[in-house]
């Protein structure tokens, strides 16, 4: 065998068995443990790129990272791993991670672009809002391309919409 | 549409070695495991090894490790299986087949016949 | 690795025949069981993955049914193209292994 292991990182477990569930996706104690972004295979006996399966049908193994992978293709968005979702970098502009920076930076010197809650944010006027469910929560299990923890950021529903449309 | 065009029959002596080649088109080469499979006369479609797409990986058979090598060439679409120190018992028809990442070949070559005899 | 068991090893029927070929691997594979077609000189093709999904452009006369060990392959109206050699395959373990094969023919 040559080449399989080329992008393995150590200390990960692996065990033995290696199986498919019915349902298509690695039961726990069966399934090797892979590197972020590859899938472990039964047949073909090794941990695959899920950048090889995501234009297929055969999603399911990889499905959050083809999402991801997807979202990142789209501008002016970005992927959550948190709250495992693509996310309109124009809803949250103004208190926005890095990975929207290069989006907001270029609407917030055009502020007629923006909606009415931003632009009132762009010129101090932050919404008071009690209502904590749109919060960012910080999490030490994000992607390496996961947004920063931004805790004080609060969504009002108008742009709650937006995020999860 | 999908097909994978092989190269033709081969006779050749025992102790040699053979060189079959598949040729894809209808799809993006690089995006699929290809695998080699061969059937004997009278015998089971057996599995012989695999190239994977994006690195040259290559995983192969207990039964003929140290004897396949499976290389591909991106630019031409093709892979390509050598068996060497060839014995009468590697006779067979030798197929390359395009793995669907569900555990199934969906698309097969039409077949290779590799005679080996003195 | 897993051993496939296909029987019968042949098989004689007449155009319109319901015919059933089946497959029996040595350990549970799930649903991971796949049926193909061989005709002498032609390339061999993709029937049924994942146990009853028929593969694009296959007729629906053919169907497939099982899981964990045993698994069946059925055509409800045989037709004159249908003569040919049939083979499981598990796609659930490393290495991928395959049945004997059933060669059905014309009575």
């Known amino acids: 065998m040559s080449g399989l292991g080329r992008s393995r990182r150590g200390g990960r477990s692996r065990v033995d068995q290696e199986e498919r569930s019915p349902q298509g996706l690695w039961t726990g104690v069966a399934m090797r443990s892979c590197p972020e972004e590859q899938y472990w295979d039964p047949l073909l006996g090794t941990c695959m790129s899920c950048k090889a399966i995501c234009n297929h049908q055969s999603q399911r193994t990889c499905a959050t990272f083809c999402r991801s992978l997807n979202c990142r293709k789209e501008q002016g968005r970005f992927y959550d791993h948190l709250l495992r979702d693509c996310i309109s970098c124009a809803s949250i502009c103004g208190q926005h991670p890095k990975q929207c920076a290069y989006f907001c930076e270029n609407k917030l010197r055009s502020p007629v672009n923006l909606p009415p809650e931003l632009r009132r944010q762009r010129s101090g006027e932050v919404e008071n809002n009690s209502d904590n469910s749109g919060r960012y929560q910080g999490s030490e299990h994000r992607g390496s391309e996961a947004s920063p923890a931004l805790p004080g950021l609060k969504l009002s529903a108008d742009q709650l919409a937006l995020v999860y449309s | 549409q999908v097909q994978l065009v092989q190269s033709g029959a081969e006779v050749k002596k025992p102790g040699a070695s053979v060189k079959v080649s598949c040729k894809a088109s209808?799809?993006?080469?690089?995006?699929?495991?290809m695998h080699w499979v061969r059937q004997a006369p009278g015998q089971r479609l057996e599995w012989m090894g695999y190239?994977?797409?994006?690195?040259?990986?290559?995983k192969y058979s207990q039964k003929f490790q140290g004897r396949v090598t499976i290389t591909r060439d991106t630019s031409a679409s093709t892979a390509y299986m050598e068996l060497s120190s060839l014995r009468s018992e590697d006779t067979a028809v030798y197929y390359c087949a395009r793995y669907d990442w569900e555990g199934s070949f969906d698309y097969w070559g039409q077949g290779t016949t590799v005679t080996v005899s003195s | 690795d897993i051993q496939m068991t296909q029987s019968p090893s042949s098989l004689s029927a007449s155009v319109g025949d319901r015919v059933t070929i089946t497959c029996a691997a040595s350990q549970d594979i799930s649903n991971y069981l796949n049926w193909y077609q061989q005709k002498p000189g032609k390339a061999v093709k993709l029937l049924m993955r994942y146990t009853s999904r028929l593969h694009s452009g296959v007729p629906s006369r053919f169907s497939g049914s099982g899981s964990g060990t045993d698994f069946t392959l059925t055509i409800s109206s045989l037709q004159p193209e249908d003569f040919a050699t049939y083979y499981c395959?598990?796609?659930?373990?490393?290495?991928?292994?395959f049945g004997g094969g059933t060669k059905l023919e014309i009575k």
């Open positions: 190239i994977l797409p994006y690195n040259d990986g290559t």
């Open positions: 395959q598990q796609g659930n373990r490393f290495p991928p292994t």
């Open positions: 209808g799809y993006t080469f690089t995006n699929y495991v």
